[in-house]
């Protein structure tokens, strides 16, 4: 159901100062400028809805241009506690403290927030990504070392009058960007405390947040070019489905990935691609400007709606799931990576999904909204879409009841 009822002042409208406050690209993450400490130290911070720690580089590292120098901040307070965060590949560890934090192109407020000062890391920082830390925007349940460490957004809402909601517009370029282009280009917007009408077209459709840890949602149906994958919907959410700006790909559970690839292969069979392409190990290239978008299917994910037995669908184009790769063989070619991959931890709706949509993380009402992004990449024949309502029965059965564990994701 669309959400057009009146809301409290400041909740909707224009947030000019926050529009275009993100930089980056799907492969290396989107970042916002933040300041930490007194006097303020400016850092670029990865926006990650798949984790819950605010963590910044706090020691020299070959991939960092700058880092948080706690000794230079008069407002830094040491919590005398360490934190260690391992990922599937890589890790970071550091020391916990608090300091004053603000977002220059965000709400005009300063908050005291928990900060993990990263002193050691492995395969965490990305060479050339231009970010020096991570802003985990998910819930306290998955914060490290435990859920007693209040996440940044919780602190922001508690200490200010900022409404408990943020929205993201991630703008994929549709073509590879070199380092200087990334610095000069618009990467999108993070609207803190509201929704900006100018960033989307059509209506916003909302899906419930199933549980407040990750931003967990329920997928009830998947279609490739309108053809139902016809799987038990529990498979789509095994063991969870999350919306994660810190992950590049659309990641799917093994069985779902295999069925989806089989269907995408069949739909695009006018051209044959090596297995390595479907596994994300090889790029496929075309002479510049000749990418045959039309041979690739659209992918629709149906999400549980806010009303009983009602769902809506979000549809992405190949322009979202074929990710342009910089550093290609030559500028004569347009090369792409297949940005759908296999997952052992459930469905992850990463940047390639989010780049099609304006996504509203309405924490206050425990729901996530989707609308067609005003900046999504499309062609003259097809566009990303958010459509509904559809009648879908027994949607509650699509959720998987996971044994409780503690895990987090980042740009995989």
């Amino acid at each position: 159901e669309t959400d057009e009822e009146p809301e409290e002042p400041g909740r909707r409208g224009s947030f000019v100062e926050m529009v275009d406050n993100l930089r980056g690209k799907s492969g290396q993450g989107y970042y916002v400028e933040m300041t930490v400490g007194s006097p303020p130290q400016t850092l670029n911070i990865l926006v990650d809805t798949g984790s819950s720690n605010f963590a910044v580089g706090a020691a020299p590292h070959p991939f960092l241009h700058r880092y948080y120098q706690r000794q230079l901040s008069s407002t830094y307070r040491d919590l005398r506690k360490g934190v260690y965060v391992p990922y599937t590949q890589g890790k970071w560890e550091g020391e916990l403290g608090t300091d004053l934090v603000s977002i220059p192109h965000g709400p005009n407020v300063t908050v005291r927030a928990n900060i993990a000062a990263i002193t050691e890391s492995d395969k965490f920082f990305i060479n050339g990504s231009n970010w020096e830390g991570i802003l985990g925007l998910a819930y306290a349940e998955i914060a490290r070392p435990d859920d007693s460490l209040e996440p940044f957004f919780d602190s922001l809402v508690k200490q200010t009058h900022v409404p408990n909601l943020f929205s993201l517009q991630l703008c994929g370029a549709g073509f590879p960007l070199n380092q200087s282009e990334v610095l000069a280009s618009v990467g999108g917007s993070m609207i803190i405390g509201g929704i900006d009408h100018s960033l989307y077209t059509g209506s916003l459709w909302y899906t419930p947040i199933r549980r407040e840890w990750y931003y967990e949602v329920i997928i009830v149906r998947v279609e490739i070019n309108g053809q139902d994958l016809k799987m038990d919907c529990k498979e789509y959410n095994y063991d969870k489905s999350i919306v994660d700006s810190g992950t590049t790909n659309l990641r799917l559970p093994k069985k779902v990935f295999e069925a989806a690839v089989k269907s995408i292969k069949a739909a695009s069979s006018t051209e044959k691609f090596p297995d390595g392409f479907w596994l994300g190990e090889q790029l496929v290239c075309w002479q510049a400007g000749t990418t045959p978008w039309n041979i690739f299917p659209v992918i629709s994910l149906y999400l549980m709606g806010e009303v009983t037995n009602q769902s809506f669908r979000i549809t992405i184009l190949p322009q979202q799931y074929l990710r342009p790769v910089e550093d290609v063989a030559t500028s004569q070619d347009d090369c792409y990576k297949f940005a759908i991959s296999q997952s052992s931890t459930g469905t992850v709706m990463g940047a390639v999904i989010m780049e099609g949509f304006y996504v509203v993380f309405d924490r206050a009402r425990k729901r996530i909204g989707f609308a067609v992004s005003a900046c999504h990449v499309h062609d003259e024949f097809r566009t990303a879409a958010v459509e509904g309502p559809f009648v879908t029965l027994d949607m509650e059965d699509c959720g998987y009841n996971i044994p409780q564990t503690d895990e987090s994701t980042l740009m995989t």
Epitope: E271, F273, F277, V284, C285, W286, T330, D333
Partner: antibody, heavy 126, light 107 residues
């Protein structure tokens, strides 16, 4: 702009050694194969050796196996051809050429050597 | 090693002529054949890759065909700048062997 620049050629006595360099720019060196191809005066093209920096795979023509060694320094985007035990029949213009590896699949297949350097002359004579 | 036998070794033709050069591999090389053009004192230039794909910037009068063992380079209407030596090369198996070349001269 893609560029391959060879250097290191010159006059050397039979049995001597020489190291050729191929400095690359304007493309992803790591995911390319670098080939050395030579051309004796008035003759056709002869493939000599190749290296794929990302896999470390090297390959040689029978005529140079055991005498020539191809290598690459990815930090410098440079490939090298170390030539030992040189013979008169090794006299030629040596070209380095670039080929996208199988990391790049072109919708119609795999590309060939699409960029070449200007060549460097190696003369083996007493 | 795979031998690439190119024919003819030379040919004389006039501007506007249709020219065909053939190359035969001693065993199947799938479609992994390239054609290069070389002018005196210059490096070779790629014309055709994967047997029939025209390389970017190469005039459409050049075309390639064939697969397996038999391959053809065709110049539909010879232009003055096309007088050069042409080489086929297989890149299916190492060593990547070249044909001996075909010199296209002015009649």
């Amino acid at each position: 702009e893609v560029q391959l620049v060879e250097s290191g050629g010159g006059l050397v006595q039979p049995g001597g050694s020489l190291r050729l360099s191929c400095a690359a720019s304007g493309f992803n060196f790591y995911y390319s194969s670098i080939h050395w191809v030579r051309q004796a005066p008035g003759k056709g093209l002869e493939w000599v050796a190749s290296i794929s920096p990302y896999s470390g795979y090297t390959s040689y023509a029978d005529s140079v196996k055991g005498r020539f060694t191809i290598s690459a320094d990815t930090s410098k985007n440079t490939a090298y051809l170390q030539m030992n035990s040189l013979r008169a029949e090794d006299t030629a213009v040596y070209y380095c050429a670039r080929q996208p590896t199988h990391y790049y699949y072109y919708a119609k297949g795999y590309k060939a050597m699409d960029y070449w350097g200007q060549g460097t002359l190696v003369t083996v004579s007493s | 090693d795979i031998q690439m036998t190119q024919s003819p070794s030379s040919l004389s033709a006039s501007v506007g002529d249709r020219v065909t050069i053939t190359c035969r591999a001693s065993q199947s090389v799938s479609s992994a054949v390239a054609w290069y053009q070389q002018k005196p004192g210059k490096a070779p230039k790629l014309l055709i890759w994967w047997a029939s794909s025209l390389y970017s910037g190469v005039p459409s009068r050049f075309s390639g065909s064939g697969s397996g063992t038999d391959f053809t380079l065709t110049i539909s209407s010879l232009q003055p700048e096309d007088f050069a030596t042409y080489y086929c090369q297989q890149y299916s198996y190492s060593p990547f062997t070249f044909g001996q070349g075909t010199k296209v001269e002015i009649k």
